[in-house]
């Protein structure tokens, strides 16, 4: 058989943030190429990244069709220059990925504070509603559109002059917090899906502080 020099892929790993989803694997190919297939539990296999020498394959276009489905991928190994060759069982070597359910497992990307506005002793903080690659009716959905109320944001805020942090939570992308007049505050937000078992929280957003350009102040 012509497959004696091919090795099966291993360490198949899903890397996914805000539904941008890439399958990675090892090893770096030596005299071999790879093709990836993806399927839902009940669906047909679809081939992607044909005869590639890469060790990753972007599967975003497939998983965004239904982010609540569970997907399985497999990576086939072929001898370079002889991709028709099969193994002793009559098919090329392949390795299965772990199952992957995007809605439950995609990492939440680092959020961004879009703006904050002070009116007297209240500050309205708005979190940017990041666009995903999930589509509905030919438009790209935002993170909020996809997750709905499953997604909350936690706001951490503190006086610039001290380190004691306070928190607030919201099911929208807005906060309205009480502040002391004449004090400057700093803010950071985190995206959270409390109902998840894994990947429940994003990293914290960059810190934004009052007195810098992003904010706005009104008496």
């Amino acid at each position: 058989s012509g497959t004696t020099n091919t090795v099966a892929a291993y360490n198949l790993t899903w890397k996914s943030t805000n539904f941008k989803t890439i399958l990675e694997w090892e090893p770096k190919p030596v005299n071999q190429v790879y093709t990836v297939q993806i399927s839902t539990k009940s669906g047909d296999w679809k081939s992607k990244c044909f005869y590639t020498t890469d060790t990753e394959c972007d599967l975003t276009d497939e998983i965004v069709k239904d982010v609540k489905q569970t997907y399985l991928a497999r990576v086939f190994s072929y001898p370079a220059g002889n991709v028709e060759s099969t193994g002793s069982a009559g098919e090329p070597l392949y390795e299965n990925s772990p199952e992957f359910t995007p809605y439950l497992e995609t990492n939440l990307g680092q959020p961004t504070i879009q703006s904050f506005e002070q009116v007297g002793t209240k500050v309205n903080v708005t979190v940017e509603d990041e666009r995903t690659l999930v589509r509905r009716n030919n438009t790209f959905l935002s993170l909020r559109d996809v997750f709905g109320k499953d997604l909350i944001y936690t706001l951490y805020y503190w006086k610039s002059s001290s380190s004691g942090k306070k928190t607030a939570k919201t099911h929208t992308n807005e906060f309205l917090i009480d502040v002391d007049k004449g004090e400057n505050y700093c803010f950071s937000v985190q995206a959270v899906i409390p109902s998840r078992k894994v990947n429940r929280k994003s990293t914290d957003s960059p810190v934004e502080c009052m007195g810098q350009e992003k904010g706005e102040f009104r008496e």
Epitope: D145, K169, T170, H171, T172, E174, L176, D178, S195
Partner: antibody
Framework: QVQLQESGPGLVKPSQTLSLTCTVS?????????WSWIRQHPGKGLEWIGE???????RYNPSLKSRVTISVDTSKNQFSLKLSSVTAADTAVYYC??????????????????WGKGTTVTVSS | EIVLTQSPGTLSLSPGERATLSCRAS???????LAWYQQKPGQAPRLLIY???TRQTGIPDRFSGSGSGTDFTLTISRLEPEDFAVYYC?????????FGGGTKVEIK
């Protein structure tokens, strides 16, 4: 002033699919609220069935999930409930409701603040 | 699921009296997600209290809510004739959202 109106057949045969529509008037279904279905069995308490966002994002009661589909039609300002394989135990008053954000404790949380009048559905042959 | 148990099942009182309704959760509920509804015969429920203690717009101040964790209370300080109805507590923090079994406040 947002108003909700349920519509659909009042009588459904066992094993068939119950289909109800809720029409939203006085406001847009795409304006950042969620839209829910709740039912009340005769002389009993309230049971949450599920909810939908204008984007199509849904949450369902796990006890009904295998039989329930909630969908939204933004062009008609309507959302709908389908409950399959019904039995006499699905006889109830079905309400649609708006789940709107209210300010509380520095953030915004959702509560069912506007309800339809309810429609009685009887499952019987 | 979170089970909400309301007590008493029925409360028989006269107009002008104080009504105290209890709602106990099977596990801790973030007060941000606790609401109270009023339902009269043949009508849909009406939101009275959200966030355990905040009155909905237009709700008279004789209605007040309190509590945290697993124990919540709705108090009607002086019952008016229009207050005789069934009251439900609800949690909207954990799917499935659940309602208590209701407390009927009836005229003695």
């Amino acid at each position: 002033q947002v108003q909700l109106q349920e519509s659909g057949p009042g009588l459904v045969k066992p094993s068939q699919t119950l289909s109800l529509t809720c029409t939203v008037s006085g406001g847009s279904i795409s304006s950042g609220q969620y839209w829910s279905w709740i039912r009340q069995h005769p002389g009993k308490g309230l049971e949450w069935i599920g909810e939908i966002y204008y984007s199509g994002s849904t949450r369902y009661n796990p006890s009904l999930k295998s039989r329930v589909t909630i969908s939204v039609d933004t062009s008609k300002n309507q959302f709908s409930l389908k409950l399959s394989s019904v039995t006499a135990a699905d006889t109830a008053v079905y309400y649609c409701a708006r789940d709107a954000p209210y300010y509380y404790g520095g953030g915004y949380y959702y509560y069912m603040d506007v309800w339809g009048k309810g429609t009685t559905v009887t499952v019987s042959s | 699921e979170i089970v909400l148990t309301q007590s008493p099942g029925t409360l028989s009182l006269s107009p002008g009296e104080r009504a105290t309704l209890s709602c106990r959760a099977s596990e801790s509920v973030d007060s941000s997600y606790l609401a109270w509804y009023q339902q009269k015969p043949g009508q849909a429920p009406r939101l009275l209290i959200y966030g355990a203690s905040t009155r909905q717009t237009g709700i008279p101040d004789r209605f007040s809510g309190s509590g945290s964790g697993t124990d919540f209370t709705l108090t009607i300080s002086r019952l008016e004739p229009e207050d005789f109805a069934v009251y439900y507590c609800q949690q909207a923090g954990v799917v499935p959202y659940t309602f208590g079994g209701g407390t009927k406040v009836e005229i003695k």
